[in-house]
Interface confidence: low
């Protein structure tokens, strides 16, 4: 009796859904009464399926309402654990242990990515100095550097602060501000570069025409 896994590493994005799968040999009709399926992540119990029933009382609170064993897949010889709305805390090593005549187990690693995809940006003007203040803010994991560049490929020096997200403890809230004297229609880019990751996320900021009071416009 040997369990197989089609993948032993899953890399998914924060907030997405994932199905981890272990396969086991089934002859003809599956006998649910002798099948035992356990899914665990490190020391957290996720699924305990015994005598044809799942025991909801053993499930670790962090998986409540988000993790389920896909029962229809059992008849195909698949112990499929579906996790919805994946959190950063879900990252780790999962173990499926199956008894069905014999017993076996396999380990599967889940990695969770949180790219700085949604970048919020603002442009304001300091009325005293006439400097433009460009701000980019995004949430992700792990920490990110923010690189400011102009359309003529100049690298500029911004000020970046990193705080914890209010949405999820492990997410970082990264805000970067660039103060610069510039003119209308100039284009600037803020690029979030996650430490240890090749994929970058960039937002484009176009300096708008200066706002003129309509009354002043009529006097010109």
């Amino acid at each position: 009796f040997t369990i197989t896994v089609s993948k032993d590493l899953y890399v998914v994005e924060y907030g997405s859904n994932v199905t981890l799968e272990c396969r086991f040999p089934v002859d003809k009709q599956l006998n649910l009464l002798v099948l035992v399926v356990y899914w665990e992540m490190e020391d957290k119990k996720i699924i305990q399926f015994v005598n044809g029933k799942e025991d909801p009382n053993v499930q670790h609170s962090s998986y409540h309402g988000r993790a389920q064993l896909l029962k229809d897949q059992l008849f195909l010889g698949k112990a499929a654990l579906q996790i919805t709305d994946v959190k950063l805390q879900d990252a780790g090593v999962y173990c499926c242990l199956i008894s069905y005549g014999g017993a076996d187990y396999k380990r599967i690693t889940l990695k969770v990515n949180a790219p700085y995809r949604k970048i919020y940006h603002t442009i304001s003007v300091d009325p005293v100095t006439s400097e433009h203040e460009l701000t980019c803010q995004a949430e992700g994991y792990p920490e990110a550097d923010v690189i400011w560049t102009s359309s003529d490929h100049q690298v500029l020096s911004g000020k970046t602060s990193i705080t914890s997200s209010k949405r999820e403890e492990k997410l970082f809230n990264v805000t970067s501000t660039l103060r610069i004297n510039t003119t209308a229609d100039k284009i600037f880019y803020c690029t979030f570069r996650r430490l240890g990751h090749e994929e970058n996320n960039t937002a484009e900021l176009v300096i708008p025409e200066p706002y003129l009071d309509p009354a002043k416009k009529r006097n010109h």
Partner: antibody
Framework: QVQLQQSGAELVKPGSSVKISCKAS????????MHWVKQQPGNGLEWIGW????????KYNQKFDGKATLTADKSSSTAYMQLSSLTSEDSAVYFC???????????WGQGTLVTVSS | DIAITQSPSSVAVSVGETVTLSCKSS????????????LGWYQQKPGQTPKPLIY???NRHTGVPDRFTGSGSGTDFTLIISSVQAEDLADYYC?????????FGPGTKLELK
């Protein structure tokens, strides 16, 4: 840090049984598979089987089926191996080894020497 | 059962030399589903417990010096110890954990010249 402390050497008579222990500390005992390995002088290493302490599931090398019985006590974080109907062939050092995520025996006990002699 | 053979059974080296240990299995240890070879290398010094060096044929365990390098795939595997140190003198075992029962080779004894 992770430690596996095994019981001391045993001198036993042929035909009898012996139960050796392996006390784990420094990690969550219930969520790692505990393997047992036999080593005879000049005979290399032989895998006996594993136990999953959380549920008591076991898997044996067929060669040791009926010879070795693996159990675990969650409350004391201790794994046990009982060897029965002992013969001189069972004289060996027995190791417990805890498995990490990559199905590799990462943490080993110091070994228990079992000598079967009349 | 999968049979594992190791060669040489013993080898004598001088400190600073490079040594190559061989391990062969009677069937492929490559698991096609994830393209990993389920082979490990262990070091056992006299009177001590085995210490894991390499998993999945090529991955070093945490804290293992980079002079230990695992290579190979399928049925033929190699452990290279470059610039051998006195503390490397030990028995080296390879073992497979793809198919039950898990099996080990008879070992290679690394001795000082």
């Amino acid at each position: 840090q992770v430690q596996l402390q095994q019981s001391g050497a045993e001198l036993v008579k042929p035909g009898s049984s012996v139960k050796i222990s392996c006390k784990a500390s420094g990690y969550t005992f219930t969520s790692n598979f505990m393997h047992w390995v036999k080593q005879q002088p000049g005979n290399g290493l032989e895998w006996i089987g594993w136990i999953y302490p959380e549920y008591g599931n076991t898997k044996y090398n067929q060669k040791f089926d009926g010879k070795a019985t693996l159990t675990a006590d969650k409350s004391s974080s201790t794994a046990y191996m009982q060897l029965s109907s002992l013969t001189s062939e069972d004289s060996a050092v027995y190791f417990c080894a805890s498995e990490e995520a990559v199905i590799s025996l990462v943490y080993w006990g110091q070994g228990t020497l079992v000598t079967v002699s009349s | 059962d999968i049979a594992i053979t190791q060669s040489p059974s013993s080898v004598a080296v001088s400190v600073g030399e490079t040594v190559t240990l061989s391990c062969k299995s009677s069937q492929s240890l490559l698991y096609s589903e994830n393209q990993k070879d389920y082979l490990g290398w262990y070091q056992q010094k006299p009177g001590q417990t085995p210490k894991p060096l390499i998993y999945w044929a090529t991955n070093r365990h945490t804290g293992v010096p980079d002079r230990f390098t695992g290579s190979g795939s399928g049925t033929d595997f190699t452990l290279i110890i470059s610039s051998v140190q006195a503390e490397d003198l030990a028995d080296y075992y390879c073992g497979q954990y793809l198919v039950y029962p898990f099996t080990f080779g008879p070992g290679t004894k690394l001795e000082l010249k």
